[in-house]
């Protein structure tokens, strides 16, 4: 009761490899690393087949496919392009993943090269499985601006210059505050901006003084103050977050998180301002913006902005010591001796941010949060020292630089 | 830039119609999509509203369920159902000037509009 | 719904007069609301938006003003290439609802 000679498979194996076969030997048939035995439509690592007692075998032999890895996952602001020809997904395929340059980043350079494993899975050197990620660049503007003039007295932006700047408006449209985007779903701004004006005889934050989340709107991507355009991106919100620290008599901690109902399309009008990677120095030169009033109390047409030093600590507490106002910590002060320059209403939660020259980044130094009148003399700006409340900001966001 | 209605036809009552919006020059999931349509020698009615990227969709209390907006990669398609003559008219599809969800900026962008006939 | 209320249904005005279209809305949009020009056989073309923003290319002798439930078209200087049926519009967007109605319209007549 001899059984027919056998033929392995293309591209697999027979075990035993033997001369002859009778009644009752059993084969195992296998496949070689990247394929996998195919039979009745059925993909399988082995198969096994006897000699019957009439001398046939109990199944015909299986054949041996090359592993599919299938299409790879999509890439959250990536793309991906196949090495191999004719766009193969097989065993020993590439591709490679990279994001969508300049506005995002992948995350520890990875090479973002994966092959398509004998498992049938693509697979990274260091990822193994998992996708790369895509991070939005910070802080480089495509837009550089052209001078610096040496809000209040200042100058008219150029567009696309201050590309992390949102404007909260109402949903009926009207601008009540600004903040700076942070990473792909973040707004910063001042917590004042956020809560109604407290009872003075009863200065107690409730919850229900504080903005719901569908009371207003994020606008990104805008240079008119009114005027709209089609390089605005206006966005709801999903929840905000005070500091817990804030106190709203005092100013103290006067910064706020906003979370959006989904992710900005990143462009040259859009995108995120760099945390500051340490303190700021006093003397050095910021750049303040925002919507708010000018000269003569009038709300400008289009993005203003004022280039002013960072003001030492001391000389700022002095000079708000004859209104009893006290400037802590966590607040950093800006502007000219002389006055002239400065934020005003309407600017609040806005960013201030200076240039890392060697790297030529643009990192968040503060946020407008208040002040004696505008642009007064002795009189400087006082805003929310961002870098005192990193650590806080990060933990909520979960944003690297 | 521009939109571009399409799919406009001589129906009779009750057959179903679809038509399409399709963008040139933008991304259409960047933006809110709204249809308007206006029947011979009427005004402008307002039929309802997607913003593509999320696809949330928005309907004039009159649509009743017998319209649907809906999204492709590339195109926002108006679904109708139960046509009747009352349904006559040109069919525009507007973008709004800003983008984003919550953009109540105006609509800049239309379609020269089509024309969909209901008669028996 | 919102509900909008243009007055007048039409309107005839002389070259360099003025006219002033007006629309009610049902309930409080704030500024969210827009005005269009339409002439025969075109489509529809912004005119304001936000109550009182004038869309890019429009003539100065355009403009709008009002808030809440009352909104103002209006045309100073009018010229004949003025003549068109001109609509107002709720933009109205909250977290939970779009709104986007339009008034009957107002054809303005050039004498």
């Known amino acids: 009761n001899e059984c027919p000679e056998l033929q392995p498979p293309v591209h697999g194996k027979i075990e035993p490899s033997q001369a002859k076969y009778f009644f009752k030997d059993q084969v195992l048939v296998s496949c070689d690393t990247g394929y996998k035995v195919l039979k009745d439509n059925v993909e399988m690592d082995t198969f096994q087949i006897e000699c019957l007692k009439d001398g046939t075998w109990s199944n015909k032999i299986p054949t041996c496919k090359i592993v599919d890895c299938r299409a790879p996952g999509e890439l959250e602001h990536g793309l991906i392009t196949f090495s191999t020809r004719n766009n193969l997904t097989t065993y020993k395929s590439e591709i490679k993943y990279s994001c969508q340059e300049p506005y995002y980043k992948m995350l520890n350079n990875n090479t973002g090269i994966y092959t398509c494993s004998a498992q049938g899975v693509w697979m990274n050197k260091v990822l193994g499985r998992s996708l790369p990620t895509c991070l939005p660049v910070c802080g480089l503007p495509k837009f550089s601006r052209k001078l610096m003039a040496r809000i209040f007295n200042g100058r008219p932006a150029q567009k696309g210059t201050t590309p992390w700047i949102a404007m909260l408006s109402h949903l009926n449209g009207q601008p009540f505050c600004g903040g700076s985007l942070l990473g792909s779903s973040w707004i910063v701004t001042a917590a004042h901006c956020l809560h109604q004006s407290l009872d003075p005889e009863d200065p107690t934050l409730r919850d229900s003084d504080l903005l719901s989340p569908s009371d207003f709107k994020i606008i990104l991507g805008k240079h008119w103050r009114l005027r709209s355009d089609e390089n605005e991106q206006h966005l709801g919100v999903k929840h905000t977050t005070l500091h817990p620290q804030y106190d709203p008599n005092t100013f103290e901690n006067d910064v706020a998180l906003v979370e959006l109902l989904e992710s900005p399309v990143l462009n040259a009008f859009v995108m995120p301002i760099c945390l500051p990677e340490g303190p700021q120095q006093e003397g050095a030169m910021v750049i303040v913006s925002g919507w708010g009033k000018q000269f003569l109390q009038r709300f400008p047409e289009t993005l203003m902005e004022i280039e002013i030093p960072i003001v030492d600590h001391s000389t700022c507490q002095k000079a708000y010591a004859p209104l009893k106002k006290k400037v802590t910590r966590d607040m950093i002060c800006a502007g000219e001796k002389e006055g002239g320059k400065d934020a005003c209403a309407g600017d609040a939660g806005g960013p201030m941010v200076t240039l890392n020259r060697e790297r030529g980044q643009w990192y968040l130094v503060g946020t407008v949060s208040w002040g004696d009148d505008c642009g007064k003399k002795d009189r400087y700006g006082v805003y929310s020292y961002i870098h005192h409340n990193k650590d806080w900001i990060q933990r909520v966001t979960g944003v690297r630089n | 830039q521009s939109v571009e209605e399409s799919g406009g036809r001589l129906v009779t009552p009750g057959t179903p119609l679809t038509l399409t919006c399709t963008a040139s020059?933008?991304?259409?999931?960047?933006?809110?999509i709204h249809w308007v349509r206006q029947a011979p020698g009427e005004g402008l009615e307002w039929i309802g509203y997607?913003?593509?990227?999320?696809?949330v969709t928005w309907y004039a209390s009159w649509v009743k369920g017998r319209f649907t907006i809906s999204k492709t990669s590339t195109t926002v398609d108006l679904k109708m159902t139960s046509l009747t003559t009352e349904d006559t008219a040109t069919y525009f599809c507007?973008?709004?000037?800003?983008?984003?969800?919550?953009?109540?900026?105006?609509?800049?962008?239309w379609g020269p509009g089509t024309l969909v006939t209901v008669s028996s | 719904d919102i509900v909008m209320t243009q007055t007048p249904s039409s309107v005839s005005a002389a070259v360099g007069g003025t006219v002033t279209i007006k629309c009610q809305a049902s309930?409080?949009?704030?500024?969210?609301s827009a005005w269009y020009q339409q002439k025969p056989g075109q489509r529809p073309k912004l005119m304001i938006y936000?109550?009182?923003t004038l869309a890019s290319g429009v003539p100065s002798r355009f403009s709008g003003s009002g808030s809440g439930t009352e909104y103002t078209l209006t045309i100073s200087g009018v010229q004949c290439d003025d003549a068109a049926t001109y609509y107002c519009?709720?933009?109205?967007?909250?977290?939970?609802?779009?709104?986007?109605?339009f008034g009957g319209g107002t054809k303005v007549e050039i004498k």
């Open positions: 309930q409080n949009i704030g500024y969210s």
């Open positions: 997607i913003y593509a990227r999320s696809g």
């Open positions: 936000g109550a009182s």
């Open positions: 519009q709720s933009n109205y967007i909250s977290s939970g609802s779009v709104d986007g109605t």
């Open positions: 507007a973008r709004v000037l800003a983008g984003g969800g919550y953009a109540n900026t105006g609509l800049s962008l």
């Open positions: 020059g933008f991304d259409i999931n960047n933006y809110a």
